[in-house]
Amino acid sequence: GSMAHSDGIFKKEQAMCLEKIQRANELMGFNDSSPGCPGMWDNITCWKPAHVGEMVLVSCPELFRIFNPDQDMGVVSRNCTEDGWSEPFPHYFDACGFDEYESET
């Protein structure tokens, strides 16, 4: 079904994200003790590593952008602070129409 299909897409996205993070860490010289915010997969989308004070913008996952083709919509941001990543802004639910991925049970 469509949920099983989307489950596969998200697993693939997660694997790609972890690869991207690893490459970005190497490029930026990031390690576990580096100041800043490590890259992460937040179960919805991928966040690249960032320096303190940096704002990172991401689009809603492609799976959901099908329903929101407008280019100035479906964008979520996080700030990298000394305490780590801020909460997503706006909330995923408001910007993308969902707030977490449901796997088929």
Epitope: F67, N68, D70, D72, M73, V75, P90, H91, D94, A95, G97, F98, D99, E100, E102, T105
Partner: antibody
């Protein structure tokens, strides 16, 4: 045809709890594409979104900060309805209360509304 | 909270007129904006969602536009049933907030 039918008392005493119910026909409170909202309208505050409940494998709620400490929105799956409870009411809570269905298409919008219930807070 | 303002607060028009109502958000909201119509004693009715999309069953004389902070609702060839109050609503930052309304009455 989606219809929302509201019920509940029109008069509540100060400090007591305002309770309203919204019965859903033509849809289900467990619809994973919908949200179920409460909104109120008064001359002094205009239209004010109070909060919503929705089901996405588990039940979730979002509440407006202005009422967060006093509000509860509960679904009732057995009757396909949802309710509003607002505690410790004051005369400022006097308003017409509406329930509404939220749907997503590029953004969230309220596409079906209940008929409205005028609730007066007075002793 | 995001503040929504509307202008004018009221306007008088005649059947057949073309009218425009403006809505402004206190911060950027992209196109996350809806328009509703309300008649006395009735619940609001959805007209336009996501700035410019016409809700099913709404006549094509209604149209919406705008992005960012400035939005407009236009009614081409005003009909007798269009005399009502119109509200905009932002739908990106909770709590979702509404404009104060624009009342359209008969000249």
């Amino acid at each position: 045809q989606v219809q929302l039918q509201q019920s509940g008392p029109g008069l509540v005493k100060p400090s007591q709890t305002l309770s309203l119910t919204c019965a859903i026909s033509g849809d289900s409170v467990s619809n994973k594409q919908a949200t179920w909202n409460w909104i109120r309208q008064s001359p002094s505050r205009g239209l004010e979104w109070l909060g919503r409940t929705y089901y996405r494998g588990k039940w979730k709620n979002h509440y407006a900060v202005s009422v967060k400490s006093r509000i509860t929105i509960n679904p009732d799956t057995s009757k396909s309805q949802f309710s509003l409870q607002l505690n410790s009411v004051t005369p400022e809570d006097t308003a017409v209360y509406y329930c509404a269905r939220g749907m997503w298409n590029q953004n969230w919008f309220l596409d079906h509304w209940g008929q409205g219930t005028l609730v007066t807070v007075s002793s | 909270d995001i503040q929504m303002t509307q202008s004018p607060s009221s306007l008088s028009a005649s059947v057949g007129d073309r009218i425009t109502i403006t809505c402004r958000a206190s911060q950027q909201i992209a196109r996350y904006l809806n328009w509703y119509q309300q008649k006395p004693g009735k619940a609001p009715k959805l007209l336009i969602y996501a700035s410019y999309n016409l809700q099913s069953g709404i006549p094509s004389r209604f149209s919406g536009s705008g992005s960012g902070t400035d939005f407009t609702l236009t009614i081409n060839s005003l009909q007798p049933e269009d005399f009502a109050t119109y509200f905009c609503q932002q739908a990106i930052i909770q709590p979702y907030t509404f404009g104060p309304g624009t009342k359209v009455d008969i000249k």
